[in-house]
Every structure is written in C-alpha cells, then in structure tokens.
C-alpha cells in the first residue's frame, strides 16, 4: 500500500520584488484525515505562511478553487513579493489530532527575490 | 458508479458483539477517509467513526466499545461492535467521507444501512 | 462539541410553495456545513456543502446560503418528491461530526 506522500515539483523559485510567486504542492491522497500548513524554515522558529482555519493571510491565497471537491492541489500564491519573502518554503501534512501532528513535508522550494526591473 | 452496501446487522443480547461490513465499489477506496454514522428509529442522524488510513476517531459514545477498520485490497469497511447496549440500537450507515478546500469532511455517500437490534 | 439547532421542527407545506429551512450553531463553523435530505426508508442524500455549493445533480430549486453560525437551506419550489426530513451537519471541529435534529418537510 503506498504510502502519502507529499511533492513540491520546484526546488526552487525566482520573483521579481512586487510580482506575485506561485509555490507549488500536491499531496498523492486524501489520508490520513488532516490538514496541510504551509512553512517557512524548519524547527521551532518556523513561520507560518498559510493554514486555511486559522489566522489571517492577506497575501496568501490558494491556487486551487476552494470549492472544488476532493482537492489534492495544495499550491498557494503569495502576492506582492518583497525581498523579507526569500527563503525555503515547505507544505506540511498533519494528522488530525489535539492537536494535529505533524505528518509529512514536502522538499521544499527556495524562494528568491529579484530586484524589481526597472 | 459509487455504491456502498451495508451487511452483518441483526439481533443481538446486550452485552453481545457484531461485525457489520461495508463493501464498497466505484471509487478509489484506498485514498478516501470513510465513515459509519448510525440512526435510532424515529431519531436523528448520529455519527459513529470515522477511519482515515491508520487513523482512527470515534463517538464518545462507543469509544472503547467499537473499533473500525479497513482492508483495502478488499475495498472493504468494517465496524466490530462490542458490549452492545440497546441504545446502540439502530440502522448503522457507511459512508463515504468527502472534502472541500484544505479539509473538513462531509458524506456524499451513503449505503443503504443495516439494522442492529440489541435486545434480550 | 458544536450543537446545530434546526427549526422548525416541522414544516407543512404545498407544492410549489417556497420553503425556507434554518440551522443554526453554537459556535462559528465558516461555511462547514452541508445538508442532507433523508427519505422514509431511505438513507440519507448530499443536498448542499461548504453552504452554499449544490451536490452534482442536485436540481437548481435547492440552494443553500449563510456563514458563521447561521445558516439557510431554500427550496424555491418545493416539488412532491422533496418530501422528507433535512438535517444540517458541520464538519468545521471534528470529532465529533454534529448533525442537527432534522426538519420534516410534509405535505399540507
């Protein structure tokens, strides 16, 4: 039986300072039951960039439409970039849990941050 | 086409136990979390479990009482009921969970139900 | 545990008469809610999820709306085979899934 697995196509990714970057993540089932969360940096210092039930993320939206039933696509665009955005990005499963436990991490995706053309 | 059907329901004592089997057919079983959600006669709807791979969440209800699994090289649900009580009394109904978005989890399909009566 | 209230318990109504069912819960569930419509001796049938999203194959006379804690299933026009009883479920915080008492839509 295989087992989730969770793909970040990209290792890394390069935007323009104020353009808009595109991180991609898919997820290869629907369990374990749990949500997925999306990170910048490993460890405890970690940020959290996305989590759809909790907190506010203007600049983060998901790619996929928020509807649509039985989504596997993860993926999240940030908008606005600016050059603090640069670093590793990872799109993290968790079981569903008090509380959730974290599961499986995509590889990653570099951000980089271009300077803007002028 | 998805279809869910339901067996192993009955008449048992309180105290007895019951195996109830949901075969399953249309859908990519092994990637889906699914559910048994059981109704009393004349009553509401009432979730009973819920199994995603190895991961397991149950009624407070039945928590140490009932246990679900699933066989996927058999497309198959499984409840084993034990210690029944009469208020476990009830068509128990598998389901097939869905999402929407990132998570949250609905049914959009049902079995047709099985009947367990615990009466002595 | 989140409570789902539906009311009213039950609705008497004719055909093709709008009918207009509520659910409300104890706490903010977003838009976690589905509705499910239950048949005699039937099991039950996705209707509506995340609110307002109508199931594949579920007539346009269907329609769900609301946020939060307050919520609305409409039947713009109900037809004779919608006799039955809705129930409301959220899956917002799980376990456990709630459902709500049900509505039993009958005829007048």
């Known amino acids: 039986e295989e087992e989730l697995q969770v793909i970040q196509p990209e290792k890394s990714v390069s935007v323009a300072a104020g353009e808009s970057a595109t991180l991609n993540c898919t997820a290869t089932s629907l369990i374990p039951v749990g949500p997925i969360q999306w990170f910048r940096g490993v460890g405890p210092g970690r940020e959290l960039i996305y989590h759809q039930k909790e907190g506010h993320f203007p600049r983060v939206t998901p790619v996929s439409d928020p509807t649509k039933r039985n989504n596997m696509d993860f993926s999240i665009r940030i908008s606005n970039i600016t050059p603090a955005d640069a670093g590793t990005y990872y799109c993290v499963k968790f079981r569903k849990g008090s509380p959730d436990v974290e599961l499986k991490s995509g590889a990653g995706t570099e951000l980089s941050v271009r300077a803007k053309p002028s | 086409e998805v279809q869910l059907v339901e067996s192993g329901g009955g008449v048992v004592q309180p105290g007895g136990s019951l195996r109830l089997s949901c075969a399953a057919s249309?859908?990519?079983?092994?990637?889906?979390?699914v559910s048994w959600v059981r109704q009393a006669p004349g009553k509401g709807l009432e979730w009973v479990s819920t199994i995603g791979a190895d991961d397991t969440y149950y009624a407070d209800s039945v928590k140490g009482r009932f246990t679900i699994s699933r066989d996927n090289s058999k497309n198959t649900l499984y409840l084993q009921m034990n210690s029944l009580r009469a208020e476990d009394t009830a068509v128990y109904y598998c389901a097939k969970d869905s999402t929407v978005g990132w998570s949250g989890d609905f049914f959009d399909y049902w079995g047709q139900g099985t009947l367990v009566t615990v009466s002595s | 545990e989140i409570v789902l209230t539906q009311s009213p318990a039950t609705l008497s109504v004719s055909p093709g008469e709008r009918v207009t069912l509520s659910c409300r819960a104890s706490q903010n569930v977003r838009s976690d809610i589905a509705w499910y419509q239950q048949k005699p001796g039937q099991a039950p049938r996705l209707l509506i999820y995340a609110a307002s999203s109508r199931d594949t194959g579920i007539p346009a006379r269907f329609s769900g709306s609301g946020s939060g804690t307050d919520f609305t299933l409409t039947i713009s026009s109900l037809q004779s085979e919608d006799f039955g009883v809705y129930y409301c479920?959220?899956?917002?915080?799980?376990?456990?899934?709630?459902f709500g008492g049900g509505t039993k839509v009958e005829i007048k």
């Open positions: 249309g859908f990519s079983f092994s990637i889906y979390a």
């Open positions: 479920q959220q899956y917002y915080d799980w376990p456990p899934f709630t």
